[in-house]
């Protein structure tokens, strides 16, 4: 889904009220620690020397909903996610680096503690490089492991 064109445009009027999540996880892993803003996430990543994983999604997107379920139920991904600073966003940030090839959802972008967006860590779709589908959990897991190999280890 390309959010530049149709972000939230198809919501039923009854659904226009924002749904307040029980936690910042919004269902992506209630046992994990999630940051609230991109700025906070960047700060935590830099100070803790842990990579940042940013998940862009929309509540009313079927592919976001589907990926969320497999992500939350995948034990290995949930375990590995503990080693990241985590942020999931239902809106776009002003940082264009987080949308190297467009503002579609769902997409997952990794950021190094050096605050470099890992544009090299991509999914399997040439037209949407940072998109993942439920069948891509093995690739996502491998990409998370790649992101844990930091660009530059700070002493």
């Amino acid at each position: 889904k390309d959010t530049t064109v149709k972000s939230g445009a198809k919501k039923d009027p009854k659904d226009s009220r924002p749904k307040l999540p029980q936690t910042l996880s919004r269902g992506w892993g209630d046992q994990l620690i999630w940051t609230q803003t991109y700025e906070e996430a960047l700060y935590r990543s830099k100070t803790s020397n842990r990579p940042l994983m940013v998940i862009h999604h929309l509540d009313e997107c079927p592919h976001s909903q589907a990926l969320k379920k497999v992500f939350a139920e995948h034990k290995e991904i949930q375990k590995l996610a503990e080693q990241f600073v985590l942020l999931n966003l239902v809106y776009e940030t002003t940082d264009k680096h987080l949308s190297p090839d467009g503002q579609y959802v769902p997409r997952i972008v990794f950021v190094d503690p050096s605050l470099t967006v890992r544009a090299d860590i991509t999914g399997r779709y040439s037209n949407r490089l940072y998109a993942y589908e439920p069948s891509d959990t093995a690739l996502l897991y491998d990409n998370m492991k790649k992101a844990l190999k930091l660009l530059k280890t700070e002493l």
Partner: antibody, heavy 120, light 107 residues
Amino acid sequence: QVQLVQSGSELKKPGASVKVSCKTSGYVFSRSWMNWVRQAPGQGLEWIGWIYPGDGDTNYNGKFKDRFVLSADKSVSTVYLQISSLKAEDTAVYFCARGGYDGSPWLSYWGQGTLVTVSS
Amino acid sequence: EIVLTQSPATLSLSPGERATLSCKASQDINSYLSWFQQKPGQAPRTLIYRANRLVDGIPARFSGSGSGQDFTLTISSLEPEDFAVYYCLQYDEFPFTFGGGTKVEIK
């Protein structure tokens, strides 16, 4: 093998309610989306909505939001479609259709359909 | 909502001939399109998902192509059991929507 077995035909009066069941087997029930689709006599297909049996999350076609309710019972691997305040125009065959085996949204397996007739 | 337009409404062909069915979306749906076959009194059967992926157990004479807004289902050589109604479905965004169907009938 995957099986979706739906409950039998129903004849109801306008204003009544009906609950159609779809009993599943042959896969992990809680980890595939279940869709409901309807087909009025001689007409095409319409998507009603879907439910994730693992946690009960739902999404409805706005057209079916008011009187249609999807639910799931993990203990018997069954999903349900309940329609209240039935109208003559609800007369249709109702199908359950499982999402992709990996949790993807596409519709893979279909139940045999349940005919609901609403007539006074 | 996204509108899917199928054409032609009816296709009259003989066994052994090639069938080409079209499905056009009112907006870009990436590759999130499925094709179904339905015979009278039966449930639909899924043939293709993600525009071009053949479902297990479906004969190789069925193939799907396209992305964005224009999609095609091709049956390379019609068998007697292929005469039926074919529907496309988009599952890119809610609500999922079906095309109006193409009836493939014996000439």
